[in-house]
Interface confidence: medium
């Protein structure tokens, strides 16, 4: 297993609809054809695998398990979108990248993106 640098933004604020997007960029030492991206969440004394996708370079990311994640890839960048977030989902979201094929296997883990989620205030009743 060889180490690889992964960069991601420090802070992202989710939209009022509970959607947060950020870029996960990895410094690929070689020409990987198969890449696995996993998003981990660290908060509330929990470490959660939020979503995971394996993709072939140049193809769309396919996430598993009715995931709250979607994503696209472009070169050594993965554009990740996490949706359906609630205030309780606030936490540090860590991007983990694995170059699966061809060998050698590379692993990189980012420092994490702190995603803040604020539940929208309910609309006040209208008098009209």
């Amino acid at each position: 297993c060889k180490a690889m640098h992964v960069a991601q933004p420090a802070v992202v604020l989710a939209s009022s609809r509970g959607i947060a997007s950020f870029v996960c960029e990895y410094a690929s030492p070689g020409k990987a054809t198969e890449v696995r991206v996993t998003v981990l969440r660290q908060a509330d004394s929990q470490v959660t695998e939020v979503c995971a996708a394996t993709y072939m370079m140049g193809n769309e990311l396919t996430f598993l398990d009715d995931s709250i994640c979607t994503g696209t890839s472009s070169g050594n960048q993965v554009n990740l979108t996490i949706q359906g977030l609630r205030a309780m989902d606030t936490g540090l979201y860590i991007c983990k990248v694995e170059l699966m094929y061809p060998p050698p296997y590379y692993l990189g883990i980012g420092n994490g993106t702190q995603i803040y989620v604020i539940d929208p205030e309910p609309c006040p009743d209208s008098d009209f």
Partner: nanobody, 126 residues
Framework: EVQLVESGGQLVQAGGSLRLSCAAT????????LGWFRQAPGKEREFVAA????????AYADSVKGRFTISRDNAKNTVCLQMNNLKPEDTAVYYC???????????????????WGQGTQVTVSS
């Protein structure tokens, strides 16, 4: 509706291992994430681990990460919790529960789960 029945709890010495099992009956079992929680005497029920519908995604409490492993076998309708290097503070009643929503969540709280089993007692002696 899914029924959950836990088993495997017993008295074990510190440093030992146990494997808890949660057997499920019901057609929708394979569609939902499942979790393990525990409740020690005089304490609130707390999250231990969870696993997604297909078994590809997992969540762990910091206190058990690296010691406990959650897995599921959808062909046999079971979810297992392998507990290694047990500590006296792991003593509790362990409950299996079904997640309320089909989709995998980023966070795991008691309020996210319903349809609880009856629990199985794990006692770790020093």
């Amino acid at each position: 509706e899914v029924q959950l029945v836990e088993s495997g709890g017993q008295l074990v010495q510190a440093g030992g291992s146990l494997r808890l099992s949660c057997a499920a009956t019901g057609r929708t079992y394979n569609s939902y994430p499942l979790g393990w929680f525990r409740q020690a005497p005089g304490k609130e029920r707390e999250f231990v681990a969870a696993i997604s519908a297909s078994g590809t995604l997992r969540a762990y409490a910091d206190s058990v990460k690296g010691r406990f492993t959650i897995s599921r076998d959808n062909a046999k309708n079971t979810v297992c919790l392998q507990m290694n290097n047990l500590k006296p503070e792991d003593t509790a009643v362990y409950y299996c529960a079904q997640h309320r929503s089909v989709g995998w969540r980023a966070s795991h709280h008691l309020s996210d789960y319903d349809n609880w089993g009856q629990g199985t007692q794990v006692t770790v002696s020093s």
